[in-house]
Every structure is written in C-alpha cells, then in structure tokens.
C-alpha cells in the first residue's frame, strides 16, 4: 500500500469505493450500489447504506426478511430508491411494480399498492425507541452510569448531538433509548436520528459499518454490556396509514 491508498478510505462507511481523484487529489468516496459521493466526516444516510448492502454479493447477507406483519423494521431489506441527497424517496417500488410509502427511515407506513399509489411527501420519523435486552449479569447496571455511557456512545461514535437523546430508561434486563428530533430541531450538519439508530443497530448485531474500527465494545464501569435482543420502534410526525385489516392482523 502507498500513502495515498492508505489514507484514502472512508472512516464512517466501509461500504464505499474510494480513490484520491477528487479536486486537488482529494480522497473521494462513493457508496457501493448507488455510486453517490459520500461525506466521510459524518454518518452515511440509511438509504445509501441499504442500497450498498443490497448490491453486495447475496451470500454476504446473513439476515432474513422479517414477517410481513411485523410492526417494527427488523432490518427490512429491500433495494431502496434514494434522492440526490441520499434520503429515501417517499415512494418505494419493487421489480414487480408493487409500491408503498415509507418514512424518513425507510420503513413502510402504508399498505402496498400498484404504480398508481401516491406518496405526497417523505414523512419524518421524529421519535425512535430502541428497546434492548441485555444478557444476564451479576447485578443490575447502575442506571446513571448506563445513561452516561449510552449518551457518550451516541455523541462520540455516532456524532449525534446530545439534545437528540431524549431519555435512557432501565428496568433490568430491558434498556430503552429514546431519540427525538423534529424537523424544526434538525440543523444543517446534524446527524439524523434514523441514521444514528441504524449504525447503532448494525453495531449491536456485530456488523459495524465503520472502516477498520473494532466492533462495538460497550462497557459500563468496566462491565461488558452484551445485548441479546433489539427492537426498534419508529414514530412518525404524521401517523401511518394502514387499512383496518393490517391493524387487526
């Protein structure tokens, strides 16, 4: 390896191809799948990451598609359409012309329809509840230590502004992390809570998206915090529109 190649990598996204051919020899990285340029000083959008993931060889995928009736998105894998900024397009369709509307984190928020389905706007997910169950430990974690460690993690690893971590709840063995971010609160350059939650989810599953960094080693006062189950709930600024059939299923 040479200095140029060694230094031309994307620390925040390993699903990229980088080369030092930008203006003035700047290292430029493009997301796999979409070929879109990414800003490696911050998190890559979930849409581009999903697209990159779907472009990877099929045997690289280890997770199965969640149940049709799941109320949470357990890494619901599909090849999304992203806009020029890397956000999810409000309407997503598959190869068989089945379409549905998604929220800003790419989770379906309507029944599936055909190509005539209209999704007028991308509805923002403003509240994310990350529900974790940790493996048994000798005793419960100290709540304030746990709170501090998780807030530090979101601030330092995911670069999420502390004001967007609304609360950390703990009732052994369940930990809940609440992320809140209204459209009006999100300033230019702020990491999106949806992107931070996705990076965290992949970290917890041992599938870190960061380049060359070790996996996530969560410790509370030196005690390893090992997660055995993760559920993520998404709340949108406008409630989803599912038919009664879906709601009673």
């Amino acid at each position: 390896h040479t200095a140029a190649q060694d230094n031309c990598t994307c620390p925040t996204n390993k699903m990229t191809v980088c080369s030092p051919d930008g203006p003035g020899g700047r290292c430029q990285c493009r997301a796999l799948g979409s070929g879109m340029a990414v800003d490696c000083s911050t998190l890559t959008s979930k849409c581009l990451l999903l697209k990159a993931r779907m472009s990877a060889p099929k045997n690289a995928r280890t997770l199965v598609r969640p149940s049709e009736h799941a109320l949470v998105d357990n890494d619901g894998l599909y090849d999304p359409d992203c806009d020029p900024e890397g956000r999810f397009k409000a309407r997503q369709c598959n190869q068989t012309s089945v379409c549905w509307c998604v929220n800003s984190v790419g989770v379906r928020r309507t029944d599936k329809g055909d190509l005539s389905l209209r999704c007028d706007e991308l509805v923002r997910t403003h509240h994310i509840l990350i529900d974790l169950r940790h493996r048994p430990t000798a005793g419960a974690f100290n709540h304030s230590d746990l709170d501090a460690e998780l807030r530090r993690l979101f601030r330092e690893r995911y670069r999420l502004h502390p004001k967007f971590v609304a609360a950390v709840h703990y009732e052994q063995p369940t930990i809940q992390i609440e992320l809140r971010q209204n459209t009006s609160q999100k300033a230019a350059g702020d990491v999106d809570i949806g992107d931070a939650a996705y990076y965290f989810e992949r970290d917890i599953k041992g599938e870190s998206l960061f380049q060359g960094r070790g996996g996530l080693d969560l410790r509370v006062r030196g005690e390893p915090l090992q997660v055995e189950r993760t559920l993520i709930y998404y709340l949108d600024e406008i409630p989803p529109k599912f038919s009664m059939k879906r709601l009673t299923a």
Partner: antibody, heavy 116, light 107 residues
Framework: QVQLVQSGAEVKKPGSSVKVSCKAS????????INWVRQAPGQGLEWMGQ????????HYNQKFQGRATLTADKSTNTAYMELSSLRSEDTAVYYC?????????WGQGTLVTVSS | DIQMTQSPSSLSASVGDRVTITCKAS??????LSWYQQKPGKAPKSLIY???RLVDGVPSRFSGSGSGTDFTLTISSLQPEDFATYYC?????????FGGGTKVEIK
C-alpha cells in the same frame, strides 16, 4: 523521494501544438493525480486540468476544454499535456504537479514560447 | 467557478515582522485550501494544506487558519528566505482556482 521531471523548453508557431511531458519517480504513479498549472510571464498561477492515471479520469478547466489533452502512460510513469491551436497568449511556464489532499510536489516547469 | 480573492497583492515588511495574508472564497470551501510559496524562476512549493495543516519540513513560523470563506496565512517572524510570492488555492471543487498572489518584499 518524489520527483517530477519535465521536458525542455519549446518555441512554437501560432496555430501549432505542443506536448509537454512529466516523468514521475519515487512513488506509485497510478496512486496520485497529476495536475497541470501554467504561469504567464509576470502573472499568477492558472489551473489547466487534472488526470488520475489510476483510472484515466480527468477534469479540465473549461477555458482549455477542446484545446488541452491530458494523457498518462503507465508503462513509463509519464504524464503528458498537449495544447493545440497555440496563440501568443499561451506563452507561459507549464508545471505538472502531483497532488494529494491539496499537498503538491511540483515539476521544474517547461517554458513554452509562442511566436511567429 | 469559485473566485479566490487574495489580499494584499503586495506588502513590504522587515525581518522579524509578523505577516498576515488573507484569502477570501466566493463561497464556502470546507477548508479545502492550500498555500504555496514561489520564488522567482522557481516552481511553487507547498506550505499548508487543508487550511491549517503544515507540510512536513516547512518551518513552524508558517501557519494557516480560517474556515468557511475566509482564510489566513501567517508568518510569525519573517526570515530573509521568506521574501517571495504566496498563493492560495481552493480544491473544494473543479475547476481549481488560485488567488491572485501576494508579493512579500523587503522594506
């Protein structure tokens, strides 16, 4: 150490073409971009274009689009800049420079004089 | 194209003086700015890249600062070998553009 050695001075007639070479050594040629910059007598620096030998991608200053051609010969680690339809205002010192993240190593320069 | 306005175009200073040269971009350039020194009849030499990173081997009296659109090259204590012309370059986007240059002369 990184070295860029350019071809010698040229005197050209208006309307003709000139091809300046830039031989690189001391690093892997395909790993860095080469930029071309010119400087008219007593004037400032003017960017002409950039080539990345690793993938033969290039970018040109619109001002030189169609007149300048950048190429790279990976077998000899040499970059070339050809400028056609020369006019008197093209009289300048032409520099090649290896760039990485804005940090540049420069060739010694090639004086091209266009005169009838 | 991004315009780079360098000032002053020339200045006279004495050995030991603190010298400041500024470069203003017509739009934000994300700190993708370099500074070069050029002496008569010679090729330019890199001093600073990424707005504030000193090139290996360049004396620590040279420093770069600024962000957004306004950038500064400072020579903390001018030495005899520093009399030259200085250029800034933006490499945020194509085409790359240089400032007009600042000639530092002996007072």
């Amino acid at each position: 150490q990184v070295q860029l050695v350019q071809s010698g001075a040229e005197v050209k007639k208006p309307g003709s073409s000139v091809k300046v070479s830039c031989k690189a050594s001391g690093y892997r040629f395909t790993d860095y971009v080469i930029n071309w910059v010119r400087q008219a007598p007593g004037q400032g620096l003017e960017w002409m274009g950039q080539i990345y030998p690793g993938s033969d991608t290039f970018h040109y200053n619109q001002k030189f689009q169609g007149r300048a051609t950048l190429t790279a010969d990976k077998s000899t680690n040499t970059a070339y800049m050809e400028l056609s339809s020369l006019r008197s205002e093209d009289t300048a010192v032409y520099y090649c420079a290896r760039f990485f993240e804005g940090l540049a190593y420069w060739g010694q320069g090639t004086l091209v004089t266009v005169s009838s | 194209d991004i315009q780079m306005t360098q000032s002053p175009s020339s200045l006279s200073a004495s050995v030991g003086d603190r010298v400041t040269i500024t470069c203003k971009a017509s739009q934000g350039i994300n700190n993708y700015l370099s500074w070069y020194q050029q002496k008569p009849g010679k090729a330019p030499k890199s001093l600073i890249y990424r707005a504030n990173r000193l090139v290996d081997g360049v004396p620590s009296r040279f420093s770069g600062s600024g962000s957004g659109t306004d950038f500064t090259l400072t020579i903390s204590s001018l030495q005899p070998e520093d009399f030259a012309t200085y250029y800034c370059l933006q490499y945020d986007e194509f085409p790359l553009t240089f400032g007009g240059g600042t000639k530092v002369e002996i007072k």
